[in-house]
């Protein structure tokens, strides 16, 4: 496909498009992870995810079903992304006794410390509550060593789930997640519906929440959630996540219930002008002359920094790799070394607008 050509100034220098010689026209370049539905896509709607909703592309390039968090005792920890499964964890007030890949096979309620004992470590999604004697002296509850053991997860008659606290304030909206990943409320301190395919957590005490109408029987607690591709901002409003649909960007972290999607420059490019949650301007990764020394960093970061040659020498960097290989993308801090005079203005091509969102993020909301 022509969109696999190296990144270059085609179609009036618009990186979101490429020129297809076969059809003799400018075509929209589908973002990474999306496939065109026709030979020469004209708009984002002509691009589709590689996998169906609720499937992700695994290491073997197969579309694999994301795990579901639809069991009543599970909540979604991280959403199903194009290249990674959804991850579930035990809902607040419960811990995992039998783990499973990207999920938990068995959740139990956190134990309540018996009389004479206090919480040493509160329960988490992974661990049960750990109790300790209330005072240095041995309390009646600890008369026998048996009573001082951490209760076994299966036999805790006094265990109680974390109480559900009602939302009190009244904001203008309180959307639920919809679309291909409609979800039931499964927030911290909230219960969730058994029938929901996935869940996205919301704190029950978020500012700007208003109680909804009661839910149908068995559907759990309805509280503020946002539609897909929206997150709950600091003011308690559902706000659009930035999109990474510019061809030179890839998704770094997905759009989550309380944070925007973040984008970074695609491999082979570095960020010349950074922006909140994204990069306003990516430039081709430079190939530097012999006198520029490459200094490897921690491989986990997959970053490379460039050390300037001794004073008096001039590094000679080509704008594009000559061998066609693209190193991993780099952080904005490195890019300043490469392009310290990077323009702070953002060109806005007419066919693929880029704008700064209300949080200063560049948004190319092209779908």
């Amino acid at each position: 496909f022509p969109q696999d050509r190296p990144f270059e100034d085609t179609c009036h220098g618009n990186p979101s498009h490429y020129y297809d010689k076969a059809v003799r026209r400018c075509c929209y370049r589908c973002p990474m992870g999306l496939f065109p539905t026709q030979q020469c896509p004209q708009r984002p709607t002509d691009c589709r995810k590689q996998c169906e909703p609720d499937y992700y592309l695994d290491e073997a390039d197969r579309c694999t079903a994301c795990v579901t968090c639809s069991r009543d005792d599970l909540v979604e920890k991280t959403p199903c992304a194009w290249n990674s499964s959804r991850v579930c964890e035990c809902r607040p007030g419960m811990f995992c006794s039998t783990s499973a890949v990207n999920s938990c096979a068995r959740c139990f309620f956190h134990s309540v410390c018996p009389a004479g004992m206090i919480v040493k470590f509160p329960g988490t999604a992974q661990k049960n509550t750990v109790c300790e004697p209330a005072s240095p002296g041995v309390s009646p509850a600890c008369a026998s060593p048996e009573n001082c053991k951490e209760p076994s997860s299966g036999t805790i008659p006094q265990a109680k789930p974390t109480p559900v606290s009602p939302a009190t304030s009244s904001a203008s909206t309180m959307p639920v997640r919809g679309g291909t990943r409609l979800a039931q409320e499964a927030a911290s301190k909230l219960t969730r519906a058994p029938d929901s395919p996935s869940s996205v957590g919301r704190p029950s005490s978020d500012p700007g929440l208003s109680p909804t109408q009661p839910c149908p029987e068995g559907s759990g607690d309805c509280r503020k959630q946002c539609e897909p591709d929206y997150y709950l901002d600091e003011a308690g409003r559902c706000t659009a996540c930035v999109s990474c649909s510019r061809d030179d960007l890839v998704e770094k972290t997905p759009c989550a219930w309380n944070s925007s999607r973040t984008c970074e420059c695609r491999p082979g490019m570095i960020c010349a002008t950074s922006a909140t949650n994204s990069c306003a301007r990516c430039v081709p990764y430079p190939i530097c002359a012999a006198e520029t020394v490459t200094k490897p960093q921690d491989m986990a970061e997959k970053d490379t920094t460039f050390e300037a040659p001794p004073l008096g020498t001039q590094p000679d960097c080509n704008p594009t790799p000559e061998n066609g290989e693209a190193p991993a993308s780099t952080s904005p801090t490195q890019s300043l070394l490469v392009d310290s005079q990077a323009s702070k203005t953002l060109p806005i091509p007419t066919s693929a607008p880029v704008a700064l969102s209300s949080t200063g993020k560049p948004v190319l909301d092209a779908g």
């Epitope: 973002p31 992870g33 999306l34 984002p44 709607t45 691009c47 589709r48 995810k49 194009w82 203008s172 909206t173 959307p175 639920v176 997640r177 919809g178 679309g179 291909t180 409609l182 979800a183 039931q184 409320e185 519906a193 029938d195 929901s196 395919p197 909804t212 839910c215 149908p216 559907s219 759990g220 309805c222 959630q225 946002c226 539609e227 897909p228 591709d229 929206y230 901002d233 409003r237 559902c238 706000t239 659009a240 930035v242 999109s243 649909s245 007419t350 066919s351 693929a352 607008p353 880029v354 704008a355 700064l356 969102s357 209300s358 993020k361 948004v363 190319l364 909301d365 092209a366 779908g367």
Partner: antibody, heavy 123, light 106 residues
Framework: QVQLVQSGSELKKPGASVKVSCKAS????????IHWVRRPPGKDLEWIGY????????DYNQNFQGRVTITADKSTSTAYMELSSLRSEDTAVYYC????????????????WGQGTTVTVSS | IELTQSPSFLSASVGDRVTVTCKAS??????VAWFQQKPGKAPKVLIY???YRESGVPDRFTGSGSGTDFTLTISSLQPEDFAEYFC?????????FGGGTKVEIK
């Protein structure tokens, strides 16, 4: 193809309630939220709220909070919008709408609309 | 977020170039859609993400803008284009709409 078919016109007295239906077809009903929007004569379109048919959870614009109830019946793929304590300013064309399904992102602009239901509130 | 659309009314002739503007009270990125509505009909989406034409929409309709200022342009008005046009922001809930622009025959 996606279709949203709404119930017929309603004439109501002030203080009464009205329940408008929206039957969806051409897609899996539980996959998308159904939104309700109204347009009073000579005024702007106004977003009322929406329902998640999968969970039954609904959300409303603060302007309607307490007076509106949006529900959904999965068995018939129908969403309902009930507005109570009607007043003359509730006279409007009420629309149900569904967001688009396009590519990787799921922002809420409406590609599919019902034909509209005229609700007249008059004594 | 308030959307202020202008003009409210516009008289034009077939073949005219028509421009409608929509100003948001705060930054909405490019999260704006434009709709056309004819009397007795449901709105029809023309443009989404500020500048992308919906499939099947004639290329005489173009959208532009970002941040707070958006424009819908009809390059050469056709008889079927006489209708009302309005913008919608979907950046932040509650979703809001512009007041509409009625394009009438001169």
């Amino acid at each position: 193809q996606v279709q949203l078919v709404q119930s017929g016109s309603e004439l109501k007295k002030p203080g009464a309630s009205v329940k408008v239906s929206c039957k969806a077809s051409g897609y899996t009903f539980t996959t998308y939220t159904i939104h309700w929007v109204r347009r009073p004569p000579g005024k702007d379109l106004e977003w009322i709220g929406y329902i998640n048919p999968s969970s039954g959870c609904s959300d409303y614009n603060q302007n309607f909070q307490g007076r509106v109830t949006i529900t959904a019946d999965k068995s018939t793929s129908t969403a309902y919008m009930e507005l109570s304590s009607l007043r003359s300013e509730d006279t409007a064309v009420y629309y149900c709408a569904r967001r688009a399904d396009y590519g990787n992102y799921e922002y809420t602009w409406f590609a599919y609309w019902g034909q509209g239901t005229t609700v007249t509130v008059s004594s | 977020i308030e959307l202020t659309q202008s003009p409210s009314f516009l008289s034009a002739s077939v073949g005219d170039r028509v421009t409608v503007t929509c100003k948001a009270s705060q930054n909405v990125g490019t999260n704006v859609a434009w709709f056309q509505q004819k009397p007795g009909k449901a709105p029809k989406v023309l443009i989404y993400s500020a500048s992308y034409r919906e499939s099947g929409v004639p290329d005489r309709f173009t959208g532009s803008g970002s941040g707070t200022d958006f424009t819908l342009t009809i390059s050469s008005l056709q008889p079927e284009d006489f209708a009302e046009y309005f913008c919608q922001q979907y950046h932040t809930y509650p979703l809001t709409f512009g007041g509409g622009t009625k394009v009438e025959i001169k």
